[in-house]
Interface confidence: low
């Protein structure tokens, strides 16, 4: 299996709303691990099932 | 965004297939275009994708055979699968995905078909 | 790669009833899980993307809920233009991965 995230670069840290940044590992460009209570590419939705 | 496959329809095995998509209404150098296949059976397959940059995913399973390709110019990617066989039978889809994993916008699909 | 497990394979209600559709993956996908509705000749739509967040223009009465490995689509209130196949998909770990889907039959 490869893994969707690698570490993101510090030019990077405000890119998540409500999460904490990522790179995709087949791409150059960044991804979201969300705090709990949120979801999406960008951690943007509130999660009201959380 | 509107999205459409174009495609031979019938292939023999070990021919190469070739499939369009052709996009209006939206820019292949923005986003992630992906192509996705539905077997007999309903199974569907995630092949890969040409992202904004040009770069490209291909699934490991099809490595060995897979191609994603685009024109700008024309705003189409298109898919290249080589040595086809039996196994490769199945509706064809091209999708957009705005992350790179959320498919969003989806064309109708070309059904191919590989036979002797 | 993740395999996607669907349950069950086919389902058969009537309109009005309300119904859950069984999703589960063998490895921890964080709610990067979305649902596709595909009907007959038709092409997939997006249901409900990162397990539960809804989509512009899809009826209220479709619902996701789950994290980790185990996710849910309900469907409030079915209606006999509901029937199709419905796929999950993860979107955690490369290469993304579906499910086997699921047959709601609208009785």
């Known amino acids: 299996v490869v893994s969707h995230f690698n570490d993101c670069p510090d030019s990077h840290t405000q890119f998540c709303f409500h999460g904490t940044c990522r790179f995709l590992v087949q791409e150059d460009k960044p991804a979201c691990v969300c705090h709990s209570g949120y979801v999406g590419a960008r951690c943007e939705h509130a999660d009201l099932l959380a | 965004v509107q999205l459409q496959e174009s495609g031979p329809g019938l292939a023999k095995p070990s021919q190469t297939l070739s499939l369009t998509c052709s996009v209006t209404g939206y820019s292949i150098t923005s986003d992630y275009w992906n192509w996705i296949r539905k077997f007999p059976g309903n199974k569907l397959e995630y092949m890969g994708y040409?992202?904004?940059?040009?770069?490209?995913y291909y699934n490991p399973s099809l490595k060995s055979r897979i191609s994603i390709t685009r024109d700008t110019s024309k705003n189409q990617y298109y898919l290249q699968l080589n040595s086809v066989t039996t196994e490769d039978t199945a509706t064809y889809y091209c999708a957009r995905s705005y992350d790179g994993i959320c498919f969003d916008n989806w064309g109708q699909g070309t059904t191919l078909t590989v036979s002797s | 790669d993740i395999l996607m497990t669907q349950s069950p394979a086919t389902l058969s209600v009537t309109p009005g009833e309300t119904v859950s559709l069984s999703c589960r993956a063998s490895?921890?996908?964080?709610?990067?899980l979305h649902w596709y509705q595909q009907k007959s000749h038709g092409t997939p739509k997006l249901l409900i993307k990162y397990a539960s967040a809804p989509i512009s223009g899809i009826p209220s009465r479709f619902t996701g809920s789950g994290s980790g490995t185990d996710y849910t689509l309900s469907i409030n209130s079915v209606k006999p233009e509901d029937e199709g196949i419905y796929y999950c998909l993860q979107g955690y770990s490369m290469p993304w991965t579906f499910g086997g889907g699921t047959k709601l039959e609208i009785k």
């Open positions: 490895q921890n996908t964080y709610k990067n």
């Open positions: 040409i992202s904004y940059s040009g770069s490209t």
